[in-house]
């Protein structure tokens, strides 16, 4: 299926945005809670699956769109259902920080996809 025509955000750009929204922040999105996810199960779609539920929070919209673009690029991305811990909720900022840590690791090891 055709993907959108766009230069997909790079991992570096995603890292920059995640750093931008987490630096000097104790909380994000008024402390909204989201499901914890296993980022190893397709990190873009997994993170998006949790963050898609957050509304009225302009701070993470750019991150959501970046994840959506990256998730959309993957084969049958819409079909992937990530492992999600249905009994564990964490704050949005914690999920974003977890994602930042994970993405930095991926970036360092050069496994961009």
């Amino acid at each position: 299926s055709p993907s959108p025509v766009t230069p997909s955000p790079t991992l570096k750009e995603l890292i920059e945005e995640l750093v931008n929204i987490t630096q000097n922040q104790a909380s994000l999105c008024n402390g909204s809670m989201v499901w914890s996810v296993n980022l190893t199960a397709g990190m873009y779609c997994a993170a998006l699956e949790s963050l898609i539920n957050v509304s009225d929070c302009s701070a993470i919209q750019r991150t959501q769109r970046m994840l959506k673009a990256l998730c959309s690029q993957k084969p049958a991305a819409g079909q992937i259902s990530s492992e999600r811990s249905r009994d564990t909720k964490i704050e949005v900022i914690q999920l974003v920080k977890n994602l930042l840590t994970y993405v930095r690791g991926v970036y360092r090891h050069g496994n961009f996809r």
């Epitope: 898609i52 509304s55 769109r65 959309s72 819409g78």
Partner: antibody
Framework: EVQLVQSGAEVVKPGASVKVSCKTS????????IYWVRQAPGAGLEWIGY????????TYNQNFKDRVTLTADKSTSTAYMELSSLRAGDIAVYYC????????????WGQGTLVTVSS | EIVMTQSPASLSLSQEERVTITCRAS??????LAWYQQKPGQAPKLLIY???NRYTGVPSRFSGSGSGTDFTFTISSLEPEDVAVYYC?????????FGAGTKVELK
């Protein structure tokens, strides 16, 4: 109050280009993307793409590949959609919109701009 | 591209009757689904977002439910001002895609 005001109706010749403007007010222009959607007469809604005025980043629908260009002028809080190589199938009302409440959920819309292709 | 199949294409009901419209996605879109109302000569208006959240100022007779691939939009009691075309939109994946629309008329 968020407002989006679009330029007036256009009549253009086949093969030519058209540029539609969308002037925004009532919010910080760089905070949210501007989306573009079109609607052919008597038909449904078709998403064209969006531009993020913050960094100029764009995402386009593949159906408009190579023919559409989205731009944004921060100094005037105005977004533009240019469509080239126009044909009869491009006759439609073109809307701009913003999404504030949730990502990609377009909630504030312009009044629409009718583009007619005629020789 | 995710295809949104909306049904029925049109329906004609009496005032105060219950309206039910369905939208089926060709892939799992989680709960990233919105519903719009469009009247002739007007831009679409957002009614419901993230499957079941009513947008500001939208009357309580409008509601949405579902998840994954199957979604339902309901008007609990049809009013004359509800005559319009209703569209679903998936916003899980790019490109964003709309259903073909459902025309709601009064008998």
């Amino acid at each position: 109050e968020v407002q989006l005001v679009q330029s007036g109706a256009e009549v253009v010749k086949p093969g030519a280009s058209v540029k539609v403007s969308c002037k925004t007010s009532g919010y910080s222009f760089t905070d949210y993307p501007i989306y573009w959607v079109r609607q052919a007469p008597g038909a449904g809604l078709e998403w064209i793409g969006y531009i993020d005025p913050y960094n100029g980043g764009t995402t386009y629908n593949q159906n408009f590949k190579d023919r559409v260009t989205l731009t944004a002028d921060k100094s005037t809080s105005t977004a533009y959609m240019e469509l080239s190589s126009l044909r009869a199938g491009d006759i439609a009302v073109y809307y701009c919109a913003t999404a504030v409440v949730a990502t990609d959920v377009m909630e504030n819309w312009g009044q629409g701009t009718l583009v007619t292709v005629s020789s | 591209e995710i295809v949104m199949t909306q049904s029925p294409a049109s329906l004609s009901l009496s005032q105060e009757e219950r309206v039910t419209i369905t939208c089926r996605a060709s892939q799992n879109v989680r709960n990233a689904l919105a519903w719009y109302q469009q009247k002739p000569g007007q831009a679409p208006k957002l009614l419901i977002y993230l499957t079941s959240n009513r947008y500001t100022g939208v009357p309580s007779r409008f509601s949405g439910s579902g998840s994954g691939t199957d979604f339902t939009f309901t008007i609990s009691s049809l009013e004359p001002e509800d005559v319009a075309v209703y569209y679903c939109l998936q916003h899980w994946n790019y490109p964003l895609t709309f259903g073909a629309g459902t025309k709601v008329e009064l008998k």
